[in-house]
């Protein structure tokens, strides 16, 4: 018995199909004689150029998903379109992006919220991954909260995952922060600082964002300069003190550790002081003290009389006891340290006779 094709059914090898795989559709319809022509439909729309019993798609794409149906035709007539078959195409999440929810710019210490967005996914996204890994909070699926963001948190990337994970391009957090690792560096001299030296100090820092910075130098809390270098053409002992530098940008300012600048100098401002005074009665005691200002302190003293004769005393104090009238005259001292020598002006000691001596005369 010959008859026109009966309503057709579609068999799919295989559904669900993974994106990129191949799929074959078979149109089955009882007919005698066998169908000679087929019309294929995808979601109700005729597929152009497909007239065979089998349709082969070598590389399936997400848009190939949907209902496939067919109509068979022989010399006796055209069959009816059956209910068709559903092709499910599975694929990783598409167009994944990491989105920063915060207003820009982000500053060190801020709380940063990021979301992981995607365009489509089959099957549904069930989890998210983040790079780098951190002890960060995920308040909800696809949302990351970074509390107290660090200056060195540079980029973050997320992945949306179903059976596969799709990674977004990393997003730059561009965290802004105050200058870091601010330090004073002595450029010149590389050795100890002597009075009269040319001295250069540099204010260094390792990084800053934004890069535009200002420098401030201070000594004992007083502002000295606003350049990265602090220069002394000829340093003096009065320049000694506690120095620090500050670097600031629009986010904040950072200070270096304080550094005590020490100036070494030969003994200066020497003077001979006399006790109990510069007029002493014979027989009493007179103490001459060599007072000076030196760094390092004076290590060696030399005493001289009015004839520039050195005296056999090398301590800071010269004690004359009992003092004699012959001790009257001008004295001076010389102080020596590792830097050099300094001398005092002359100081005159007057020794007068005692009443007893005058009485005997």
């Amino acid at each position: 018995v010959q008859y026109a094709p009966e309503p057709s059914t579609v068999q799919i090898l295989h559904s669900p199909a993974v994106e990129g795989s191949q799929v074959e559709f078979l149109c089955m319809s009882l007919a005698n004689p066998l169908p000679t022509n087929y019309t294929w439909y995808h979601n109700g729309k005729e597929m152009q150029g497909r007239t065979e019993e089998k349709v082969h798609i070598p590389k399936i794409l997400p848009w190939h998903a949907g209902t496939y149906s067919c109509v068979a035709e022989n010399i006796l007539g055209t069959g009816q379109r059956g209910p068709g078959a559903e092709l499910d195409v599975q694929y990783p999440p598409k167009k994944v992006t990491t989105v920063i929810q915060n207003p820009m710019p982000i500053r060190e210490g801020d709380t940063v919220t990021l979301s992981c967005n995607y365009n489509s996914s089959n099957p549904s996204v069930t989890r998210y991954e983040w790079k780098p890994h951190g002890a960060w909070e995920e308040p909800s699926l696809g949302v990351l909260k970074i509390q107290n963001v660090g200056w060195d948190n540079t980029t973050i990337a997320c992945a949306a995952c179903n059976s596969w994970c799709s990674w977004a391009s990393p997003v730059a957090l561009n965290v802004q922060y105050a200058p870091r690792d601010v330090r004073v560096r002595k450029i010149k001299p590389l050795s100890e600082i002597h009075s009269g030296n040319s001295v250069s100090l540099q204010c260094d820092f390792s990084s800053s964002h934004p890069k535009e910075v200002q420098f401030f130098w201070e000594k004992n809390g007083r502002l000295l300069g606003k350049e990265s270098q602090l220069n002394f053409d000829s340093i003096s002992p009065e320049d000694a003190g506690s120095y620090s530098c500050w670097v600031n940008n629009s986010i904040g300012q950072t200070a270096s550790k304080a550094w005590t600048l020490e100036v070494l100098y030969a003994p200066r401002r020497l003077r001979v002081s006399m006790s109990p005074g510069d007029q002493v009665m014979e027989g009493k005691s007179a103490t001459l003290t060599c007072e000076s200002d030196a760094n390092p302190p004076v290590s060696h003293y030399t005493w001289f009389d009015w004839n520039n004769q050195s005296l056999p005393y090398h301590s800071q104090k010269l004690r004359l006891e009992p003092v004699k009238v012959q001790h009257s005259g001008a004295y001076w001292c010389q102080g020596t340290n590792s830097v050099g020598k300094g001398r005092s002006p002359l100081s005159t000691l007057t020794v007068y006779y005692s009443p007893e001596t005058i009485g005997r005369r």
């Epitope: 004073v184 450029i187 010149k188 590389l190 550790k257 304080a258 550094w259 005590t260």
Partner: antibody, heavy 125, light 108 residues
Framework: EVQLVQSGAEVKKPGESLKISCKGS????????IAWVRQMPGKGLELMGI????????TYNPSFQGQVTISADKSISNAYLQWSSLKASDTAMYYC??????????????????WGLGTLVTVSS | EIVLTQSPGTLSLSPGERATLSCRAS???????LAWYQQKPGQAPRLLIY???SRATGIPDRFSGSGSGTDFTLTISRLEPEDFAVYYC?????????FGQGTKVEIK
């Protein structure tokens, strides 16, 4: 990244002249001293001298004074070590290094970091 | 000039062991101005310690420095395979700055 890149290995004859270079990058070259250090085959490290590119002030180790010349060109971030007349005993690896440091408290520290990879100089007839 | 003498010349140890390297100065090194460097074959030296005891950036805490005056020590608490190298001390307290002759730490 702070880097010092040194010129390539040299093979010379005794009596010839030579100038090797060290190029700094990733920092303000003019504000850091550069040191030159010699290491003879199988031996230890010897500081030859240092230069401040900002004004080309140079300090030589007395052992090397008059034997070599250290110079710098801050405009191209280069430091140089040169010989006017090489000897076989100049055969060695020569390193340049940045003199880093900082001051705090009452101290000022200095150190060599980073170092170039070295230039091997071979002097042989 | 200050002469630095390192001892021993060679130290033969196994990974995991403790290494103690000595550096003695011919005169006192002011303010502990002493640094330590590590040099592996075919490589440039690398800064480990400055100021006798401060670790340089990125140096593992198994490296420690101590000492003052004329006697200084570098200690590696547990030797790792990458620690076998030559170690140099260097003073920067007085001019000219000088290096010790080095201590080689080799695998036993």
């Amino acid at each position: 990244e702070v880097q010092l890149v040194q010129s390539g290995a040299e093979v010379k004859k005794p009596g010839e002249s030579l100038k090797i270079s060290c190029k700094g990058s990733g920092y303000n070259f003019a504000t850091y001293w550069i040191a030159w250090v010699r290491q003879m085959p199988g031996k230890g490290l010897e500081l030859m001298g240092i230069i401040y590119p900002g004004d080309s002030e140079t300090t030589y180790n007395p052992s090397f004074q008059g034997q070599v010349t250290i110079s710098a060109d801050k405009s191209i971030s280069n430091a140089y070590l040169q010989w006017s007349s090489l000897k076989a005993s100049d055969t060695a690896m020569y390193y340049c290094a940045r003199v880093g440091g900082y001051c705090s408290g009452t101290s000022c520290h200095n150190w060599f970091d980073p170092w170039g990879l070295g230039t091997l100089v071979t002097v042989s007839s | 000039e200050i002469v630095l003498t390192q001892s021993p010349g060679t130290l033969s140890l196994s990974p995991g062991e403790r290494a103690t390297l000595s550096c003695r100065a011919s005169q006192s090194v002011s303010s502990s101005y002493l640094a330590w460097y590590q040099q592996k074959p075919g490589q440039a030296p690398r800064l480990l310690i400055y100021g006798a005891s401060s670790r340089a950036t990125g140096i593992p805490d198994r490296f420690s420095g101590s000492g003052s005056g004329t006697d200084f020590t570098l200690t590696i608490s547990r030797l790792e395979p990458e620690d076998f190298a030559v170690y140099y001390c260097q003073q920067y307290g007085s001019s000219p700055w000088t290096f010790g002759q080095g201590t080689k730490v080799e695998i036993k």
